[in-house]
Interface confidence: low
């Protein structure tokens, strides 16, 4: 009698997650009389697929029909496939008995599940930083197979090359998980910058995935600040104007203050949008200058974004001419009480 | 998932030198960086050091004159040489792994070896 | 060297009810580009320690949510907002701004 041989043809078959596995299995002999069964794994632990006798196994079908006289292909149909599935299963002959006794097991086919990465999702960091500074962008995708994956990084279409890249778990997974994290040095132009994270994977047929996330919720341009009078037509005022350029993001709160005493507070309102992304504002104070006394100066001082103030000084300059416009019995503040509390221009 | 064991003498002579070798199971070396920890009898926990994949290696500068980490790729193990015992250095001696990534630094001492007892007795 | 002082030095509790744990550094542990560097970790009896929290307030993996990290700068709490048998231990925190790593004194956290 001719020994009896499972043939799992196979060693290894590859689908994508959603589509239907085919397991083929082919006995030599029709005796001894006795079932098959399809097994995950092997062992006592292993999980029962597929047994002709009894059992619903909804997703399993048998390629041809098991009733049929004289049949020796046990080949079975999985369908909708999803990585849980991933593992090596076995065709096993049964000899008949009470209970039946397992007689010969094929080699084993090692079902390999394709599953597309998850759409990359680039977070930032909490905390704003200045130009000059590192700040890190990190790119999660999930539930991905086989872990093979390339991922790059893109700042405005230049690819980056500081980053660093996890693959998880490092052993054998039914998915897997990509964590990379880049550093990005920041320049005063990166307001309308953005930084890309691109996934590649076998399941995505050179269609890469791509997360996206903008430096303008990372990044904080200081301002500059420059001071300066011009006079005004009535002979006795003059303009004293606080310029605040090239800052972002708009948040500003500007107060003046004469020779170190808070004199106004403003918080930014009209601004002027610099190509780059940026903003400048404008503040101003009309002062009488018969009111002053001699070495007034008027300081500009610039909270932005919750950062400690910065400030910019200026001594009043009056011309001799002015003085002599002014009776002597002038007095009162430096800043013309009829003045606005500001203005933008 | 990844294992750490420690192995290595549980006694060692003073002034001699302690060795002691920690074993990445289930895992890579590569992007961490290999941690010995180590905690006297009933005291709290002092880092002695630490070694990146690429060798690169850090320690506590109140050891750093006695101790030496090194790293053995080929062999998914990283070591520890202890110079001058005394014992005060007896203690359970951990590996441990640190996760490193770049941008970010060190976010977590995420996996530990159960420990190994080492005492210092002549 | 960064120095971590951690308070209490004991913490009874009662299971089911809230539990917190101060940990002050020497000097600030956020960097300017936004992280905390310091974590938590708990070592139960006869445990090696494990990570409960890292860069401040993400818990680590398989930590349950009932503990929770706060605080920026030096000064920084671990909550539990109810507390369980499991939990008893010694809590420590760890500064991994700079080397030397720096762990505090510990807490022990014990069942009334």
């Known amino acids: 009698e001719e020994e009896l041989q499972v043939i799992q043809p196979e060693k290894s078959v590859s689908v994508t997650a959603g589509e239907s596995a085919t397991l083929n299995c082919t006995v030599t002999s029709l005796i001894p009389v006795g079932p098959i069964q399809w097994f995950r794994g092997a062992g006592p632990g292993r999980e029962l697929i597929y047994n002709l006798k009894e059992g619903h196994f909804p997703r399993v079908t048998t390629v041809l029909d098991p009733t049929k006289r004289n049949n020796m292909d046990f080949s079975i149909h999985i369908s909708n496939i999803t990585p849980a599935d991933a593992g090596t299963y076995y065709c096993v002959k049964f000899r008949k008995g009470s209970p039946d006794v397992e007689l010969k097991s094929g080699a084993g086919t090692e079902l390999s599940v394709r599953a597309k990465p998850s759409a990359p999702v680039v977070s930032g960091p909490t905390a704003r930083a200045t130009p000059e500074h590192t700040v890190s962008f990190t790119c999660e995708s999930h539930g991905f197979s086989p872990r093979d994956i390339t991922l790059k990084w893109f700042k405005n279409g230049n690819e980056l090359s500081d980053f660093q890249t996890n693959v998880d778990p490092a052993g054998k997974s039914v998915s897997y998980s990509i964590r990379s994290t880049a550093r990005v040095v920041l320049t005063r132009r990166d307001v309308h910058s953005q930084v890309i994270c691109e996934v590649a994977h076998v399941t995505l047929q050179g269609d890469p995935l791509r997360g996206t996330a903008n430096l303008s919720e990372a990044i904080r341009v200081p301002p500059t600040l420059e001071v300066f009078q011009r006079p005004m037509r009535a002979e006795n005022q003059v303009n004293v104007t606080c310029q605040v350029r090239k800052f972002y993001p708009q948040r500003l709160l500007l107060t003046w203050l004469e020779n170190g005493n808070v004199s106004q507070t403003e918080t930014a309102s009209t601004l002027t949008e610099n190509k780059d992304g940026t903003y400048n504002w404008r503040s101003w104070l009309l002062v009488n200058t018969c009111a002053h006394r001699d070495g007034v100066v008027l300081t500009c001082q610039v909270e932005h974004d919750g950062q400690p103030a910065v400030s910019k000084s200026h001594a009043l300059e009056v011309s001799a001419h002015q003085k002599e416009q002014c009776s002597d019995t002038t007095s009162g503040p430096v800043l013309a009480p009829t003045a606005p509390l500001g203005g933008s221009g | 998932q990844v294992q750490l064991q420690e192995s290595g003498p549980g006694l060692v002579r003073p002034s001699e030198t302690l060795s002691l070798t920690c074993t990445v199971s289930g895992g890579s070396i590569r992007n961490y960086y290999w941690s010995w920890i180590r905690q006297p009898p009933g005291k709290g926990l002092e880092w002695m050091g630490f070694i990146y994949d690429n060798g690169r290696t850090f320690y506590n500068p109140s050891l750093k004159s006695r101790v030496t980490i090194s790293l053995d790729m080929s062999m998914n193990q990283f070591s520890l040489k202890m110079t001058s015992v005394t014992a005060a250095d007896t203690a359970v001696y951990y590996c441990a792994r640190v996760r490193a990534y770049s941008g970010i630094g060190l976010d977590g001492t995420d996996v530990w070896g159960q420990g190994t007892t080492v005492t210092v007795s002549s | 060297d960064i120095v971590m002082t951690q308070s209490p030095l004991s913490l009874p509790v009662t299971p089911g009810e809230p539990a917190s744990i101060s940990c002050k550094s020497s000097?600030?542990?956020?960097?300017?580009?936004?992280?905390?560097?310091l974590d938590w970790y708990l070592q139960r009896p006869g445990q090696s320690p494990q990570l409960l929290i890292y860069?401040?307030?993400n818990r680590a993996s398989g930590v349950p949510d009932r503990f929770s990290g706060s605080g920026s700068g030096t000064d920084f709490t671990l909550k539990i907002s109810r507390v369980e048998a499991e939990d008893v231990g010694v809590y420590y925190c760890?500064?991994?701004?700079?080397?030397?790593?720096?762990f505090g004194g510990g807490t022990k956290v014990e069942i009334k």
């Open positions: 760890m500064q991994a701004l700079q080397t030397p790593l720096t």
């Open positions: 000097q600030s542990l956020l960097y300017s580009n936004g992280y905390a560097y």
């Open positions: 860069l401040g307030s």
